[in-house]
C-alpha cells in the first residue's frame, strides 16, 4: 500500500482582482481497490447516501474531478445501499478521476478497500484518516472551490503549506 501525496488548493476571490490560493499538503494511502496513479481535479464532496441513487446518465460529470467521501460509523448505516468499493465504483462511473475516502469513523473500510479485487478500478482510490483527514475535511467543509492533486511521489518542490 503506497503513500498517496495529496495537495489541496483552495481558491478565494479577492477584491484586488486576482485569486488567493491556499495550498495544503496531506498524505493518504492508495488502496488496492484502484490504481496507483497520479490524478487531479476539482473536489466534489459526496455524501455516502448521495451515491445510492442510480440515475447514472443524469449524474455524469465529465470533467476530471476528485470525489471526497466521509464514511460514517457503520452503526449509523447498518445496511448500506452499496459497499465501500461499490461507492468508489459509482463515483468513477459518474466521472471521478479519483476518490478519496475519509475512513476515520469507519476504519474497517480500509480492509474492504484492500481486499484484492480481481477487477480493480482504473482510477486511484485513496483513503485518509486522523490528522490528514481532519485537514482535508476542514477544507472541503468550507464550501469553496478547491482542487486536489494526488501523486504517488512526494511533490518535487517544497510546497508552502497554510494551516487551514
Amino acid at each position: 500500500k503506497e503513500t498517496a501525496f495529496v495537495e489541496v488548493v483552495l481558491f478565494e476571490s479577492s477584491p484586488s482582482g486576482d485569486y488567493t490560493t491556499y495550498t495544503t499538503g496531506l498524505t493518504g494511502r492508495f488502496s488496492r481497490a484502484g490504481a496507483t496513479l497520479s490524478a487531479e481535479g476539482e473536489i466534489v464532496q459526496m455524501h455516502p447516501l448521495g451515491l445510492c441513487n442510480n440515475n447514472d446518465e443524469e449524474d455524469l460529470y465529465e470533467y476530471g474531478w476528485v470525489g471526497v467521501v466521509k464514511l460514517e460509523q457503520p452503526e449509523l448505516d447498518p445496511k448500506p445501499c452499496l459497499t465501500v468499493l461499490g461507492k468508489a465504483k459509482r463515483a468513477v462511473q459518474r466521472g471521478a478521476t479519483a476518490v478519496i475516502f475519509d475512513v476515520s469513523e469507519n476504519p474497517e473500510a480500509i480492509d474492504q478497500l484492500n481486499q484484492g479485487s480481481e477487477d480493480p478500478l482504473k482510477r486511484p482510490v485513496v483513503y485518509v484518516k486522523g490528522a490528514d483527514a481532519i485537514k482535508l475535511m476542514n477544507i472541503v467543509n468550507k464550501q469553496k472551490v478547491a482542487r486536489a492533486r494526488i501523486q504517488h511521489r512526494p511533490p518535487r518542490q517544497p510546497t508552502e503549506y497554510f494551516d487551514m
Partner: antibody
Framework: QVQLKESGPGLVQPTQTLSLTCTVS????????VSWVRQPPGKGLEWIAA???????YYNSGLKSRLSISRDTSKSQVFLKMNSLQTEDTAMYFC????????????WGQGVMVTVSS | DIVLTQSPALAVSLGQRATISCKTN??????????MHWYQQKRGQQPKLLIY???NLASGIPARFSGRGSGTDFTLTIDPVATDDTATYYC?????????FGAGTKLELK
C-alpha cells in the same frame, strides 16, 4: 499578473488550415486549463476546445473532426489547429484560462480576428 | 448540449436595479454545486468573468453584481446600475460538455 495573448494569421483561404497560438504568463499550464472560444462578428460566444492541466483534451463535438489542441509547457504556449475552414469560421478567436474549474474562464486574451475569404 | 435562454435586451435607468435572467433546458447542479457562471462583455473587448458557481463574486468585481438560482432558473442582478455597466451579459454552464453560453442580454441605460 495573469496574461494570455493570441497570435495567428488574420486572413485564411477557404479549405485551408488555421493555426493559432496562445502564449500565457503569470500562471502555469500545469495548474490551469486553457480553452479556445470564438465569436463571429455581432454574435455570441462559442467554446471550441480545451486542454487541462493534466493534459486532458476536450472538443466541441460539432467541430471535433476538424480540431486539434496541444501545448508546450516549457514555452507556456497552447496551440489550436482547425482545418477545412469555411467563411462561417470567420470570427474573433479568444484563448481563455481556467484555474478554478476547467471551462470556467477567469482570464481572457484580447482575441485575434480571423477572416476566412478568398 | 445544454441550451441557455436569455432575453435579448434590457433598458434600465441609472441607479436602478437590473435583473437579467437565464434559463437552461437541463439541471446544472451536481452534488451541491451549481455550474452556472456570468460574464460581461463591453463592445470591442474580451469577456470578463463576473460570477461563478451561480453566486460567487469573481475577483475584482464590485459587490453591485450578484447572482442567484439553482437547477434551471438563474438571475444576475446589478444594483445600482452604473454608466460603466453598459455591455452584453452572457450566462454559461459547465455542468456538461460542451460548455455552452446564452445568446447574451444587452444592457442599455435609459
Amino acid at each position: 499578473q495573469v496574461q494570455l495573448k493570441e497570435s495567428g494569421p488574420g486572413l485564411v483561404q477557404p479549405t485551408q488550415t488555421l493555426s493559432l497560438t496562445c502564449t500565457v504568463s503569470g500562471f502555469s499550464l500545469t495548474s490551469s486549463t486553457v480553452s479556445w472560444v470564438r465569436q463571429p462578428p455581432g454574435k455570441g460566444l462559442e467554446w471550441i476546445a480545451a486542454i487541462s492541466s493534466a493534459e486532458n483534451t476536450y472538443y466541441n463535438s460539432g467541430l471535433k473532426s476538424r480540431l486539434s489542441i496541444s501545448r508546450d509547457t516549457s514555452k507556456s504556449q497552447v496551440f489550436l489547429k482547425m482545418n477545412s475552414l469555411q467563411t462561417e469560421d470567420t470570427a474573433m478567436y479568444f484563448c481563455a484560462g481556467g484555474r478554478i474549474l476547467e471551462t470556467l474562464f477567469d482570464s481572457w486574451g484580447q482575441g485575434v480576428m480571423v477572416t476566412v475569404s478568398s | 448540449d445544454i441550451v441557455l435562454t436569455q432575453s435579448p435586451a434590457l433598458a434600465v435607468s441609472l441607479g436602478q436595479r437590473a435583473t437579467i435572467s437565464c434559463k437552461t433546458n437541463q439541471n446544472v447542479d451536481f452534488y451541491g454545486k451549481t455550474y452556472m457562471h456570468w460574464y460581461q462583455q463591453k463592445r470591442g473587448q474580451q469577456p470578463k468573468l463576473l460570477i461563478y458557481l451561480a453566486s460567487n463574486l469573481a475577483s475584482g468585481i464590485p459587490a453591485r453584481f450578484s447572482g442567484r438560482g439553482s437547477g434551471t432558473d438563474f438571475t444576475l442582478t446589478i444594483d445600482p446600475v452604473a454608466t460603466d455597466d453598459t455591455a452584453t451579459y452572457y450566462c454559461q454552464q459547465t455542468r456538461s460538455l460542451p460548455p455552452t453560453f446564452g445568446a447574451g442580454t444587452k444592457l442599455e441605460l435609459k
